[in-house]
Interface confidence: low
Amino acid sequence: EQKLISEEDLAAKTLVLGKEGESAELPCESSQKKITVFTWKFSDQRKILGQHGKGVLIRGGSPSQFDRFDSKKGAWEKGSFPLIINKLKMEDSQTYICELENRKEEVELWVFKVTANSDTHLLQGQSLTLTLESPPGSSPSVQCRSPRGKNIQGGKTLSVSQLELQDSGTWTCTVLQNQKKVEFKIDIVVLAFQSTAITAYKSEGESAEFSFPLNFAEENGWGELMWKAEKDSFFQPWISFSIKNKEVSVQKSTKDLKLQLKETLPLTLKIPQVSLQFAGSGNLTLTLDKGTLHQEVNLVVMKVAQLNNTLTCEVMGPTSPKMRLTLKQENQEARVSEEQKVVQVVAPETGLWQCLLSEGDKVKMDSRIQVLSRGVNQT
């Protein structure tokens, strides 16, 4: 079993933290503050590099073997003889010895690596696992901050379940060891629709357009919109399509709806003429290599009609219980206002009538009809 290196063990050594793939500078200082003979060695006494009195950097082995090791010649005159290790590898984690002025200084280098599970492109709802690889004997703690400021912390593995769109961006992971810190940046892309639900409010006969912007464009996949009209008890397919190289192609479509799907991203679906029978809810699914994304779609349709001696305003589709339907003559007090889906006025006066669907002080939709004279039928 690997023994943890205690604070006391490290006290005699200088500790340097590094990141895999980057560079580390191991310090070695002369008390004289001037150029002097020095040698850097591995702990097994193999020479790495040094300066033996002529101001020339001498390497301890063949250039191919030692090309990652260097020093800062410009610092030698000030009595500083650092060992620079480039393109750090996990196996560089060890003790290095600097010999100068008849003394030896030990520097412990610990190289860390933080990686994201399998891929940095994940679907909304999936889990992100960040794994810290650390040298034997180290006991770091790690804390990561998401782009929206949420802190997660733990030992060698940190997990975040149910990723959201706002988790896209740069995650900052700070590794803390013996009061020293090293910071990692990991760019995570959460593949998602940019909103969780879309609701369109339309008067009968109008066109409805749904746009489904994605926060990515480089993925291929296929999708389908399943629809459940309010009057139905089942979902049925409205349209299926594929996305390839940012182009959208319709595979199958319900004939009577005359649905139109834009050929380029963002996904845009148009219903040329809505009617009460279309009102309801749908589920758009987009299947990618990594899994499936879902988007809820709602269509609320309003119809105002005059039949015989009655003016009727009707709404169909997913409305909230707090929504109110109001039928009134324009610029006059509300004649009828109910928290329900149908309101009627018998024997309406001639003039312009307005039907409003509102929630609190927000009007969701407004449909108007000109009442010509009592007893006339119009839709």
Epitope: S141, Q143, R145, K150, G155, L176, K181
Partner: antibody, heavy 125, light 107 residues
Framework: QVQLVESGGGLVKPGGSLRLSCAAS????????MNWIRQAPGKGLEWVSY????????FYTDSVKGRFTISRDNAKNSLYLQMNSLRAEDTAVYYC??????????????????WGKGTTVTVSS | EIVMTQSPAALSVSPGERATLSCRAS??????FAWYQQKPGQAPRLLIY???TRATGIPARFSGSGSGTEFTLTISSLQSEDFAVYYC?????????FGQGTKLEIK
Amino acid sequence: QVQLVESGGGLVKPGGSLRLSCAASGFTFSDYYMNWIRQAPGKGLEWVSYISSSGSTIFYTDSVKGRFTISRDNAKNSLYLQMNSLRAEDTAVYYCAREDYSNYEDYYYYYTGVWGKGTTVTVSS
Amino acid sequence: EIVMTQSPAALSVSPGERATLSCRASQSVSSKFAWYQQKPGQAPRLLIYNASTRATGIPARFSGSGSGTEFTLTISSLQSEDFAVYYCQQYNNWPYTFGQGTKLEIK
């Protein structure tokens, strides 16, 4: 000893700009996350912004996004807050604060242990 | 954002007595939670971090407890210098948020 000293406050008209500075001493400035926190007259405390030790990670509270910019100069041991398009509701004492941490049982905990004395910003016509 | 609610808004206690201040978070903040003391014209002073750890130089009469959403600051025997405004704060999610404060007054 560890010290944070804010400067740059003053009276400014709505829509105007100010730049606050915070001079740090007595510690290795480049090792610490830094923060700006404000307190409106007679009111509670509100976090405005923080910046990571390297300056690469920055957060703002929603009410100042797009108007305020936090920055740091580790070589000068200084923290800054550039405030543009100032509003009356930005009137407050602005504190510069250091985010410390303690390592405990494989976790570490942040806390704002060191504060400056504050600088007053008044936005009024 | 996480809303921190302190109670009571003001508390009158006699010196030498015990004072208990409460703070509730609108969602769990684990133990990433701190208490601060502020006197007029001064910057806040950290008392407790990590919900229950006393900051350097803070007397033992101050103690913090709780985790998740419910937190308590207890001052076991009030001294004259303890009368001030106390703020709670979470640092689990950005934006970090403070409670509205509890004013501790001399009875």
